[in-house]
């Protein structure tokens, strides 16, 4: 019998390389059975995760899974960093793995750097 616990399917150490100035949707895949849980996004600041209150979010429902989406319209250099989604379900808090956004500032970088270049050319990134 399939578990009816809420599950958040963000892969461990997942990351996205994205460009500032363009939109991006960060998805938190959520699996639940009957009632959809209350899900929030937060951004890691050291050891604490700061809840994102004034940000646009939405749900996308698919047949076997739902996605809680954090909208970046557009991505800003300040959006660089690690994010986590959390679900409140039957008084339990379920936290996802963190997912990291690497933001390239297209106004100061003429080309999008590869992951290898990110380490050697840190001025292209807000890290």
């Amino acid at each position: 019998k399939e578990s009816c616990d809420v599950q958040l399917y963000i892969k461990r150490q997942s990351e996205h390389s994205i460009l500032a100035g363009d939109p991006f949707e960060l998805e938190c895949p959520v699996k639940y059975c009957a009632n959809r849980p209350h899900v929030t996004w937060c951004k890691l600041n050291g050891t604490t995760c700061v809840k994102l209150e004034d940000r646009q979010t939405s749900w996308k429902e698919e047949k076997n899974i739902s996605f809680f989406i954090l909208h970046f319209e557009p991505v800003l250099p300040n959006d660089n960093g690690s994010y986590r989604c959390s679900a409140n379900f039957q008084s339990n808090l379920i936290e996802s793995h963190s997912t990291t956004l690497y933001v390239t500032d297209v106004k100061s970088a003429s080309e999008r750097p590869s992951k290898d270049e990110m380490a050697s050319r840190p001025w292209l990134l807000y890290r």
Epitope: L19, G21, E73, L76, N78, V106
Partner: antibody
Framework: QVQLKESGPGLVAPSQSLSITCTVS????????VHWVRQSPGKGLEWLGV???????SYNPAPMSRLSISKDNSKSQVFLKMNSLQTDDTAMYYC??????????????WGQGTSVTVSS | QIVLSQSPAILSASPGEKVTMTCRAS?????MHWYQQKPGSSPKPWIY???NLASGVPARFSGSGSGTSYSLTISRMEAEDAATYYC?????????FGGGTKLEIK
């Protein structure tokens, strides 16, 4: 220097469609977004939508079904098409450049606007 | 959608007078922009992200606020400040403008 210039038909008959072209100079459409904003006496300033640098679009959900924004990067032009115009679509239509700073996004350079009147 | 309510709708001030206009949002926003518009002209960026003056804007202007309440203040009114000022939020689509405050010189 940064410039945006709108060109439109001026007069449109009710139920017809509107096409406006925004020609930009001083910046690249692959780096900056271009927005469409209209201003009418009845509704004030209303954001219609944006063409993002990478080619995606975002629209105001209210008039979204009637709107289409496209661009030609090589010609530095952004296009607004709006279908099924009614008299309350009479307005000044502006194209506006969008720019980001480290932690905010704003519309900085505005075109002079093109006046559109919907009337038979 | 987030509704921005500006008050007062019309404001009349004498030269040298301190002027404050407000913009209230129906939901919390991260920051507020302000634009100035004079008759026959396009809106001009005036204050970015709550408190950053746009290029060329005199230092007598300032902006403040957070959450749902924001304001634009002129420390000493001058004749060239007569215009309509619009607040604008970029937190949630549709990205809305306030109805404007028309500032007149006495």
């Amino acid at each position: 220097q940064v410039q945006l210039k709108e060109s439109g038909p001026g007069l449109v008959a009710p139920s017809q469609s509107l096409s406006i072209t925004c020609t930009v100079s001083g910046f690249s459409l692959t780096t900056y977004g271009v927005h469409w904003v209209r201003q009418s006496p009845g509704k004030g300033l209303e954001w219609l939508g944006v063409m993002w640098p990478g080619g995606r679009t975002s629209y105001n959900p209210a008039p979204m079904s009637r709107l289409s924004i496209s661009k030609d990067n090589s010609k530095s032009q952004v296009f607004l098409k709006m279908n099924s115009l009614q008299t309350d679509d009479t307005a000044m239509y502006y194209c506006v450049r969008g720019d980001y700073e480290y932690d905010y996004y704003a519309m900085d350079y505005w075109g002079q606007g093109t006046s559109v009147t919907v009337s038979s | 959608q987030i509704v921005l309510s500006q008050s007062p709708a019309i404001l009349s001030a004498s030269p040298g007078e301190k002027v404050t206009m407000t913009c209230r949002a129906s939901s919390s926003v991260s920051y507020m922009h302000w634009y100035q518009q004079k008759p026959g002209s396009s809106p001009k960026p005036w204050i970015y992200a709550t408190s950053n003056l746009a290029s060329g804007v005199p230092a007598r202007f300032s902006g403040s606020g957070s959450g749902t309440s924001y304001s634009l203040t002129i420390s000493r009114m001058e004749a060239e400040d007569a215009a309509t000022y619009y607040c604008h939020q970029w937190s949630s689509n549709p990205y809305t403008f306030g109805g404007g405050t028309k500032l007149e010189i006495k």
